[in-house]
């Protein structure tokens, strides 16, 4: 009864410092609610980014001030982050929470390793 | 820092109540899963209950489950374990623990508050 | 439920001596979600490792886990005098949560 999450190993954020990623989760159970967080690890300190819970077959709702939106199908999740710059370059991890009904099951993926490249500024212009 | 503060212990005759609190500071209390594991004298741990971020998944040890509520109240960061039909078998150290943010490992635990069920 | 054992329940061992702990599940315990405490009389028990092998903020890097599916392993490379104490495994993958019996390392 083993409870799998899977995400991509490297995403690259673009331009407007958005990056998009799919966590997908294999569920032991039939669970009716289910609770998304996604953590980053710097240096072994690892912090919540942003975390929503959702019944099956809702939308996922993060919180108005959350850098995260997403949206769900079935037991995947499609997650969305903005406003990163280049010091946010990590590893950002999708974690999993069966719950509701009991028994609580957790997984947790390996990690999307997001690159976050600042935009050049736009050279002046005469 | 990390501070989790239990209160509420004491000796109480079987069949009786008590309601345990757990005070919690330095860390955003309703992002976390809190816990309550005890520990009868002399012997091992034994985890109790949990109750997860805005309060309204809980979970039970088999042992505890219908004599036992765990709460939380994230606007005073304060956990409860309120104890009911209590028997001498709940004797024991009971500690508060926050649940990791890589899982439901305990992280940080409190210095406990010891329960007597006694006659 | 998953059932854990510890062995061996006391393990006695001189400063300096390397220490193994085995911890058994009674089924795999998924994506290798298992902890290692350690209890001084007294005291709070401290998180030593999760996730199997990785080691808790502070923790010296002579203590070390490892293992996966349903067997599992603590080792102390080289055991100082405050690390004679009782080890407590614990399983979190699914609940409800389960501790093992605990092993006591003490002073040959």
């Known amino acids: 009864k083993a409870m799998h999450v899977a995400q991509p190993a490297v995403v690259l954020a673009n331009s407007r410092g958005t990056a998009s990623f799919v966590c997908e989760y294999a569920s032991p159970g039939k669970a009716t609610e289910v609770r998304v967080t996604v953590l980053r690890q710097a240096d072994s300190q690892v912090t919540e980014v942003c975390a929503a819970t959702y019944m099956m077959g809702n939308e996922l709702t993060f919180l108005d001030d959350s850098i995260c939106t997403g949206t769900s199908s079935g037991n995947q999740v499609n997650l969305t982050i903005q406003g990163l710059r280049a010091m946010d370059t990590g590893l950002y991890i999708c974690k999993v929470e069966l719950m509701y009904p009991p028994p609580y099951y957790m997984g947790i993926g390996n990690g999307t390793q997001i690159y976050v490249i600042d935009p050049e500024p736009c050279p002046d212009s005469d | 820092q990390v501070q989790l503060v239990e209160s509420g212990g004491g000796v109480v005759q079987p069949g009786r109540s008590l309601r345990l609190s757990c005070a919690a500071s330095g860390f955003t209390f309703s992002s976390y899963g809190m816990h309550w594991v005890r520990q009868a004298p002399g012997k091992g741990l034994e985890w109790v209950a949990v109750?997860?971020?805005?309060?309204?998944?809980?979970d039970y040890a088999d042992s505890v489950k219908g004599r036992i509520t765990i709460s939380r109240d994230n606007s005073k960061n304060t956990l409860y374990l309120q104890m009911n039909s209590l028997r001498a078998e709940d004797t024991a150290v009971y500690y508060c623990a926050r649940g990791g943010l890589l899982g439901p490992y305990f992280d940080y635990w409190g210095q406990g508050t010891l329960v007597t069920v006694s006659s | 439920e998953i059932v854990l054992t510890q062995s061996p329940g006391t393990l006695s061992l001189s400063p300096g001596e390397r220490a193994t702990l085995s911890c058994r599940a009674s089924?795999?315990?998924?994506?290798?979600?298992l902890a290692w405490y350690q209890q001084k009389p007294g005291q709070a028990p401290r998180l030593l490792i999760y996730g199997a092998s990785s080691r808790a903020t502070g923790i010296p890097d002579r203590f070390s886990g490892s293992g996966s599916g349903t067997d599992f392993t603590l080792t102390i490379s080289r055991l100082e005098p405050e690390d004679f104490a009782v080890y407590y495994c614990q399983q979190y993958g699914s609940s409800p949560f389960t501790f093992g019996p605990g092993t006591k390392v003490d002073i040959k």
């Open positions: 109750i997860w971020y805005d309060g309204r998944n809980k």
């Open positions: 089924q795999s315990v998924s994506s290798s979600y």
